[in-house]
């Protein structure tokens, strides 16, 4: 999916007011040190990308992320303000719910929580020059 | 104007199947979550579970999985809320409600259908 | 699970009066993440404050929220006869999504 045409400020509105929360709630208990930052992005449509990717994307470790209540509002903002964006996801999610598994946090989920993190911060930001 | 339809009450037998349904309108069915929320006579609200129109992605309250399938079909903008053998207990009312950012870009359920009357007795 | 639990279960007010509401989660939530709604007998619930303290649209200003963590609070500052009503708290921030069990208002 392109994110190109999405209403960037939007997004970063419902972010900032509760899907920020959620991930902070998901960390609670993690300093925020724990875990370097190794994923990027360098524009608010990669970032996005890169935000639907580790979210909604099973990863060794962490195949859990979709189901979680930061997941299930970034979902919704993406397919309110992301035009199309719901009608692309129809064959990934049938293909994530082949492959879901117990609902566990680990600590891969944990760090991969951290990135999220990180990209939403760089999608917030997105005149700040790259690293 | 955003608008949820319920279809209309029910009474049946223990044992039997259901089917109840939310037609929505106004706006892009596909993108927003619907959720089913129950209430019991004379008692307060329960969230049963919700599903994304866009892909059937769906969450269960573990109360109620494997006692309720909740499906939607987007080329009529409608979602499902089915049993497929009643109890008695089942006797409620059950509600539908959108799911979306406001104004001030808080979650919540911002728009509900007038419900639907389920009754279940021999 | 997080469980709402609201008190009193029954406020008996006079109009004009003012009217306090209470939430108390048992986990601490956002702000963000709880809702108030409004339920009249034979109607669907309406939004009434959403992240604790934004008034829904149309929602008249003699209703206020306000609360942090584990406990949560809608005041009415003077209540008018259409006030009457059962008054729910709810949650988003962990599934399974909960409700508090209500309190409704009456006439005194």
């Known amino acids: 999916y392109d994110f190109t045409n999405c209403d960037f400020e939007k997004i970063k509105a419902a972010y900032l007011s509760t899907i920020s929360k959620d991930l902070i709630t998901y960390m609670s208990g993690t300093k925020s040190t724990e875990f370097n930052n190794t994923v990027s992005c360098s524009n608010r449509p990669h970032c996005l990308t890169e935000i639907q990717s580790l979210t909604f994307n099973p990863t060794a470790g962490c195949a859990s992320l979709a189901k979680e209540m930061f997941a299930m509002k970034t979902k919704a903002a993406l397919a309110i303000w992301c035009p199309g964006y719901s009608e692309t996801q129809i064959n990934a999610t049938q293909a994530m719910k082949k492959r879901r598994k117990r609902k566990v946090t680990t600590n891969k989920c944990l760090e991969q929580v951290s990135q999220l993190q990180g990209l939403w911060r760089r999608f917030n930001r997105p005149l700040l020059k790259q690293q | 104007e955003v608008q949820l339809v319920q279809s209309g009450a029910e009474v049946k037998k223990p044992g039997e199947s259901l089917k109840i349904s939310c037609k929505s309108s106004?706006?892009?069915?596909?993108?927003?979550?619907i959720n089913w929320v129950r209430q019991m006579p004379g008692k307060g609200l329960e969230w049963m579970g919700q599903?994304?129109?866009?892909?059937?992605?769906?969450t269960y309250n573990g109360n109620f999985k494997g006692q309720v399938t909740i499906s939607a079909d987007k080329s009529i903008s409608t979602a499902y809320l089915q049993w497929s053998s009643l109890k008695a207990s089942d006797t409620a009312m059950y509600y539908c409600?959108?799911?979306?950012?406001?104004?001030?870009?808080?979650?919540?359920?911002?728009?509900w259908g007038q419900g639907t009357t389920v009754t279940v007795s021999s | 699970e997080i469980v709402m639990t609201q008190s009193p279960a029954t406020l008996s007010v006079s109009p004009g009066e003012r009217a306090t509401l209470s939430c108390s989660v048992s986990s601490s939530i956002s702000s963000s993440n709880l809702h108030w709604y409004q339920q009249k007998p034979g109607q669907s619930p309406r939004p009434w404050i959403f992240?604790?303290?934004n008034l829904a649209s149309g929602i008249p200003a003699r209703f206020s929220g306000s609360g942090s963590g584990t406990e949560f609070t809608l005041t009415i500052s003077s209540l008018q006869s259409e006030d009457f009503a059962v008054y729910y708290c709810q949650q988003w921030s962990s599934y399974p999504l909960t409700f508090g069990g209500g309190t409704k208002v009456e006439i005194k």
């Open positions: 106004g706006y892009a069915f596909s993108s927003y979550w």
């Open positions: 599903i994304f129109p866009g892909d059937g992605d769906t």
């Open positions: 409600a959108r799911s979306g950012f406001d104004y001030g870009y808080f979650y919540a359920m911002d728009y």
């Open positions: 992240g604790t303290s």
